[in-house]
């Protein structure tokens, strides 16, 4: 490429450099531990801590577990990438009555309209099937005069919608107002439209929320409470807890009503890779043999392999790193040659053995 | 220093076939992808295929799908690409890549190469 002779050697002799020949420019050699955001990345800020599988890149560069979706009553939207989480949506037929961050903490069926109304929108995802008179101007046929009220201004009747609670209530009854229960009435009952601004029968006001006791008129003592494994975050929205059902972990603090559940690694592991309110990868406390060092990043893929420490160097223990902190996340498909972390101590002489890193390929 | 030493090029007849292989060596860090590039005479560099080592991952240029295999061997810290039905517009100096995959994406990038190996299809 004698062509590009000026460009390549602007990079030469400068290690945070390289030149991509396939480009055709220089480029940005990111740290050790963070991948590019680019194919050429210009500046530190083209690239970024990779999470482990099933975690994402919050906005505050921490890697935070992804929702699940393995609720019957959900369905995957998108996926969880590497800088956004997985969004579950209700299943079709369904509709969600209570919302929560990336996901639906309660999901009820579509309405099905009665006798005399027909669907003027069809249920979605988010919203319940709207109904209408048959004929416009003419009112569906009275079983009851309570039937024959007119809805107030501007709502449009649906028939009650079905709940699909993902836990304790029964499906047969729904929080209402006051933290009373009613007994589900008959489907061909009308009740107003969800955004009607009184209406007996139907979720709490508050989206997700309903009180943990009835509250005394007049009394502001009503706590606001999410479903079972949903928490009421600081922003007064119901997130999921994290789940600690991978084997590696064990459940530190459970779910609260205000708190997420914590996991933390078992006991004989350690936490490599750090996570909001859990650890995104554990690893075996490192077991030293002589004139060997593990290379903690393989152990929970595949089993142990060692590598001969640098010359003069003595294998190091110390199950923590230097400052204390977590080393940061590497790519989940691992390291090619040399394992970012420990090679963050352990450069290799160019006649020492290195290994290609795969997972069982 | 680093060292992606390539081989195994050499002239064969259209129809036939070559296995190259790409020998790595020295201190690569935070490398997860390797791949094969190519260059005609004349020619820009072409890429040919690539593979992401931890998952396994292969990709392929349509030029060369279902002719070429890419492959690795981590007891020999080796990457190989078998060539099949070989064509004389395959004649090329192939050359060997190792870099990173990009996030949130399914290229590489390209940090270190070697010297290329060539490969000549003629009868």
């Known amino acids: 490429f004698p062509q590009d002779r000026p460009f390549e050697d602007t990079c030469h002799g400068n290690p945070s450099h390289y030149y991509d020949k396939a480009v055709r420019r220089c480029c940005y050699r990111c740290p050790m531990g963070l991948f590019p955001t680019q194919q050429c990345p210009q500046r530190p800020t083209d690239c970024r801590k990779q999470c482990e599988p099933d975690y994402y890149l919050d906005e505050a560069d921490r890697c935070t577990a992804c929702v699940t979706c393995s609720r019957d009553d959900l369905v995957e939207k998108t996926p969880c990438a590497w800088n956004s989480s997985r969004v579950c949506e209700c299943r079709p037929g369904m509709f969600c009555s209570t919302s929560a961050v990336n996901s639906c903490a309660r999901c009820f069926f579509h309405s099905v309209c009665p006798a005399g109304m027909i669907v003027k929108f069809p249920g979605t995802a988010q919203k319940n099937t709207v109904c209408e008179p048959a004929s416009p101007g003419v009112s569906p046929a009275c079983a009851s005069p309570e039937n024959c009220k007119e809805p107030s201004s501007g709502t449009i009747p649906q028939a009650k919608p079905t709940p699909v609670s993902p836990a304790t209530s029964s499906a047969s009854t729904m929080p209402v107002r006051g933290g009373t229960r009613l007994a589900q009435e008959a489907a061909s009952k009308l009740t107003r439209a969800p955004d009607s601004p009184s209406s007996v029968g139907r979720p709490s006001s508050d989206p997700g929320l309903s009180p943990t006791q009835p509250c005394p008129e007049g009394s502001g003592d009503c706590r606001k409470q999410c479903e079972p494994d949903y928490y009421l975050d600081e922003a007064g929205r119901c997130t999921a807890c994290v789940s600690c059902s991978r084997d590696d972990l064990v459940e530190k603090t459970p779910c609260a009503w205000n708190s997420s559940r914590t996991c933390e690694c078992r006991p004989g592991m350690i936490c490599a890779t750090s996570a909001t309110n859990s650890c995104a990868r554990c690893v075996p406390y490192p077991i030293c043999a002589a004139e060997t060092v593990t290379k903690p990043q393989d152990m929970a893929e595949k089993d142990t392999t060692f590598e001969a420490p640098p010359l003069g160097t003595q294998p190091d223990c110390n199950p923590t790193p230097e400052n204390g902190e977590a080393p940061a996340s590497t790519s989940p498909t691992q390291s090619l040659l040399v394992d970012s972390q420990a090679s963050k101590t352990l450069p290799i002489p160019t006649s020492a053995p290195v290994a290609l890193s795969s997972t069982g390929k | 220093e680093v060292q992606l030493v390539e081989s195994g090029g050499g002239l064969v007849q259209p129809g036939g076939s070559l296995r190259l292989s790409c020998a790595a060596s020295?201190?690569?860090?935070?490398?997860?992808?390797m791949g094969w590039f190519r260059q005609a005479p004349g020619k820009g560099l072409e890429w040919v295929s690539r593979?992401?080592?931890?998952?396994?991952?292969?990709y392929y240029a349509d030029s060369v799908k279902g002719r070429f295999t890419i492959s690795q061997d981590n007891s020999k810290n080796t990457l190989y690409l078998q060539m099949n039905s070989l064509r004389a517009e395959d004649t090329a100096v192939y050359y060997c890549?190792?870099?990173?995959?990009?996030?949130?994406?399914?290229?590489?990038?390209?940090?270190?190469w070697g010297q290329g190996t060539l490969v000549t299809v003629s009868s």
């Open positions: 890549a190792a870099g990173r995959v990009v996030l949130g994406a399914v290229v590489c990038t390209n940090e270190y």
């Open positions: 020295g201190y690569i860090y935070s490398s997860n992808c």
């Open positions: 593979i992401h080592t931890g998952s396994g991952s292969t």
